[in-house]
Amino acid sequence: DPVKPSRGPLVTCTCESPHCKGPTCRGAWCTVVLVREEGRHPQEHRGCGNLHRELCRGRPTEFVNHYCCDSHLCNHNVSLVLEATQPPSEQPGTDGQ
């Protein structure tokens, strides 16, 4: 069950996000998430993962890129990029949208 919390050994990760108590956290794995909200600059958040490991396997899109790793402070120096948007000439038709 991907929603069940992991109860294995914990790893220490760099924590840089609006959800961090301090500069490090302890979790089942480390995460880096790059998110771009509509009309805003992308923001990169680092932290710990305990639930929803399936997010680690998601492919990057133009709005989000999710990276996971499993060793001490492994998320500290990771930088992510978002998938480039397709140029208009290559986009499929959007009739009726």
């Epitope: 840089e16 959800h19 929803h52």
Partner: antibody, heavy 113, light 111 residues
């Protein structure tokens, strides 16, 4: 869009009980720790309690431990605060917050005889 | 009495730069991140600064945060009338195992 909507506030007599609810939407509720924070009329913010993502860890401010209980139902995307043995000094607006960024608009609890 | 100490009031004129201080201890500001919230009259608090000095998307760069030792400060440059609000600092406290807030600073924009 992240939304947190509190309900369950109202008028209660000293010694009475209330259960506050906070309905969350616009994000994966089960991925975030949640908090309750209160604000007495004309006063500052006071943290009440928090709960981790799966509900296995809870922390309370000392003055409310034993009287207040925080819980969550991830299947319903809802956070709760059960408040017992209420006192006049518990009168406040109670905010539900996603740690530590988004806040609901609050629900007013008034304890008076 | 709040665990984190803030001045009760601050003021400035439009265009000015104002700074609000927040003083704590080794168990909160000294070892954990500082957050700043803005509360406009009659509304819920809004996150302005997280992780000592980072702004969420949508918060103007007129707002900046800093931390040194067990103290922190919020600076607002190019002050505007809409900045008139209450400002709160917050941090996790390892000794209390809970979140602590400053008492709040009421910012008045003069003129």
């Amino acid at each position: 869009e992240v939304q947190l909507l509190e309900s369950g506030g109202g008028l209660v007599q000293p010694g009475g009980s209330l259960r506050l609810s906070c309905a969350a939407s616009g994000f994966t509720f089960s991925s975030y720790a949640m908090s309750w924070v209160r604000q007495a009329p004309g006063k500052g913010l006071e943290w009440v309690a928090n709960i981790n993502q799966d509900g296995s860890e809870k922390n309370y401010v000392d003055s409310m431990r034993g009287r207040f209980t925080i819980s969550r139902d991830n299947s319903k995307n809802t956070l709760y605060l059960q408040m017992n043995s209420l006192r006049a000094e518990d009168t406040a607006v109670y905010y539900c917050a996603r740690e530590f960024d988004y806040w609901g608009q609050g629900t007013l609890v008034t304890v008076t005889s | 009495q709040s665990v984190l100490a803030q001045p009760p009031s601050a003021s400035g004129t439009p265009g000015q730069r104002v700074t609000i201080s927040c003083s704590g201890s080794s168990s909160n500001i000294g070892s954990n991140y500082v957050y700043w919230y803005q509360q406009l009259p009659g509304t819920a608090p809004k996150l302005l600064i997280y992780g000592n000095n980072k702004r969420p998307s949508g918060v103007p760069d007129r707002f900046s945060g800093s931390k040194s030792g067990t103290s922190a400060s919020l600076a607002i440059s190019g002050l505007r009338s809409e900045d008139e609000a209450d400002y709160y600092c917050a941090a996790w406290d390892d000794s209390l195992n809970g979140r602590v807030f400053g008492g709040g600073t009421k910012l008045t924009v003069l003129g």
